[in-house]
């Protein structure tokens, strides 16, 4: 058993049918010695008396808020949560496996640049009685500071019969140098509590691997005289690291017809302009990627050909 | 990216071209190592990230762009020098700061070259003959060193009398390639910045 926060304790259980469970001793936080009784949650049934209460925790019915009283007055509370270990592996009931970029990906994180700021998000089908708390650091043995905000509900989607809820959190490395070569990964730890179930999820990454630039901005077309060709120009996104000559991007320019089946013409360039043939009813899209370290491409910025 | 790519201007200073070749070569070599050594811990998540140049060179700090000198987090630890202008030493006069940056890059390349050559000698003794270093990568390191045009003492190739542990050697190869790829990215960024200065 360990303390998650003041008066909240996590009991780790080897989870299988008929498991013996864990013996837990609760102590009433009071100078009083006699006349103390114990109850669980809203029930008035007295579970025991005395300054300590010994319980065998096996199932969720044994978890909850234990309260010690004296003469009708509440003395202290202890909330017991359960953390299930199923055949040597901690349970992952609360969050959905996003399966991207690989199986067992519960937390996904992205950064728009090398400033040390990143966003992580996760999915669940649970709508109520759910709390998250997020901690992060650079490295784990001698951790350096990363500050995370509160996790917030960022999107709701309907997936088949189920509603899916997306939560996200923003974190910032306390002292980040955009040009630094990372040798220790960022560690992100999310504590999730649903009713009386506790779970924790972790992700470990280098900022360089989670970079996804914003789409190029100010995408414009300039028709070339007496030609079906147009000059496409764009700019680096505002959120990208500076100077741009050091943090350079490469770009992919795509001409896409109205029909998804039509052949796409693609050109790759390091410049912020390109000359392409603009077909009728087509659209021109541009996306960006770090020129030197191939992490994710940005989303597309698009303009119609007409 | 096996699709049309707009080619750089021919007037571009020589080191940029060499540094781009270097990054391409080390990335290809790393990819090959990860595929060939699929039963070894060779992914970024599995290896220890070691930097053989740590405490010997200070490329990141010495080559820091002027714009980042205001960022205190970039100025921690060592004495730092900043790039102001310039290009490859052979092509025009270079400031003192600039020389520090480029000589630091040169020292990095020299250190990695020695490590890779020593490692290749061990890998050639492996009866499995599973993986060897790409000669193209070694050649590209050499070309960039020549373009940087520094004269420094030659570091003797390390020779080892004991029987090599091929498993450990292959894991060390993965560690070296990951670290060298990260350094090659920094070198490319620096050269791109210098080219624009």
């Amino acid at each position: 058993i360990w303390e998650l926060k003041k008066d909240v304790y996590v009991v780790e259980l080897d989870w299988y049918p008929d498991a013996p469970g864990e013996m837990v001793v609760l102590t009433c936080d009071t100078p009083e010695e006699d006349g103390i009784t114990w109850t669980l949650d809203q029930s008035s049934e007295v579970l025991g008396s005395g300054k300590t209460l010994t319980i065998q925790v096996k199932e969720f019915g044994d978890a909850g808020q234990y309260t010690c009283h004296k003469g009708g007055e509440v003395l202290s509370h202890s909330l017991l949560l359960l953390h299930k270990k199923e055949d040597g592996i901690w349970s992952t009931d609360i969050l959905k496996d996003q399966k991207e970029p690989k199986n067992k990906t519960f937390l996904r994180c992205e950064a728009k640049n090398y400033s040390g700021r990143f966003t992580c998000w996760w999915l669940t089908t649970i709508s109520t009685d759910l709390t998250f708390s997020v901690k992060s650091s650079r490295g784990s043995s001698d951790p350096q500071g990363v500050t995370c905000g509160a996790a917030t509900l960022s999107a709701e989607r309907v997936r088949g019969d189920n509603k899916e809820y997306e939560y996200s959190v923003e974190c910032q490395e306390d002292s980040a140098c955009p040009a630094a070569e990372e040798s220790l990964p960022i560690e992100v730890m999310v504590d999730a509590v649903h009713k009386l179930k506790y779970e924790n999820y972790t992700s470990s990454f280098f900022i360089r691997d989670i970079i996804k630039p914003d789409p190029p901005k100010n995408l414009q077309l300039k028709p070339l005289k007496n030609s079906r060709q147009v000059e496409v120009s764009w700019e680096y996104p505002d959120t990208w690291s500076t100077p741009h000559s050091y943090f350079s991007l490469t770009f992919c320019v795509q001409v896409q017809g109205k029909s998804k089946r039509e052949k796409k013409d693609r050109v790759f360039t390091d410049k912020t302009s390109a000359t392409v043939i603009c077909r009728k009813n087509a659209s021109i899209s541009v996306r960006a990627q770090d020129r030197y370290y191939s992490s994710s491409w940005s989303e597309w910025a698009s303009v119609p050909c007409s | 990216r096996n699709l049309p790519v707009a080619t750089p201007d021919p007037g571009m200073f020589p080191c940029l071209h060499h540094s781009q070749n270097l990054l391409r070569a080390v990335s290809n070599m790393l990819q090959k190592a990860r595929q060939t050594l699929e039963f070894y811990p060779c992914t970024s998540e599995e290896i220890d990230h070691e930097d053989i140049t740590k405490d010997k060179t200070s490329t990141v700090e010495a080559c820091l762009p002027l714009e980042l000198t205001k960022n205190e987090s970039c100025l921690n630890s060592r004495e730092t020098s900043f790039i102001t202008n310039g290009s490859c030493l052979a092509s025009r006069k270079t400031s003192f700061m600039m020389a520090l940056c480029l000589s630091s890059i040169y020292e990095d390349l020299k250190m990695y070259q020695v490590e890779f050559k020593t490692m290749n000698a061990k890998l050639l003794m492996d009866p499995k003959r599973q993986i060897f270093l790409d000669q193209n990568m070694l050649a590209v390191i050499d070309e960039l060193m020549q373009a940087l045009n520094f004269n420094s003492e030659t570091v003797p190739q390390k020779s080892s009398l004991e029987e090599p542990d091929f498993y450990k050697t292959k894991i060390k190869l993965c560690i070296l390639l990951h670290a060298f790829r990260i350094r090659a990215v920094t070198i490319d960024r620096v050269m791109s910045y210098l080219n624009a200065s």
Epitope: Y16, E59, E86, D87, I89, N103, K104, T125 | F39, P41
Partner: antibody, heavy 115, light 112 residues
Amino acid sequence: QVQLVQSGGGVVQPGRSLRLSCAASGFTFSSYGMHWVRQAPGKGLEWVAFIRYDGSNKYYADSVKGRFTISRDNSKNTLYLQMKSLRAEDTAVYYCKTHGSHDNWGQGTMVTVSS
Amino acid sequence: SYVLTQPPSVSGTPGQRVTISCSGGRSNIGSKTVKWYQQLPGTAPKLLIYGNDQRPSGVPDRFSGSKSGTSASLAITGVQAEDEADYYCQSYDRGTHPALLFGTGTKVTVLG
């Protein structure tokens, strides 16, 4: 004590369907994940499918994906395996089993797919 | 499509020490725990070892499990006639958990 009693096995023609049941007692069935495992005559153990405690997630072996469906009725304390488009290679003893470091197995039920 | 490899058979005389190996990879035995089962003819498998080296109550102490790197092994110290059975190792794979990965199985024969 924990008990898993299986039923539903038998002889069936290729292409036909069969449903296996596994009735649980002696524990809170709705709290635990459950597996189906099979063993072809004279062969080793092969995992078939898994279902989470609340039925929210189901996982299948590639060899049965799209043909077999694992389900559970927590109000009846029963686990099911619906098998469709049966093939000769599905002939095996099928076992249900609890998920956990200590597990309990059903007695097994024989499924024979033969014309 | 077994990923965990066991020797098809091992044998020993009563009282001898018999070991069965189970070889896997980094994504299964290398990063997950291992179980061992005993299966007597015509019966369901019986758990012998869980968590690499833990014995459930009721399992004789002549059975012991161990794991090193990407391999695990089961040892029967002082093998007895009633130990003649099939033995299976079981683990998980990081990417496909909770799918069970079983070993190919080993037939233990007690001679004499």
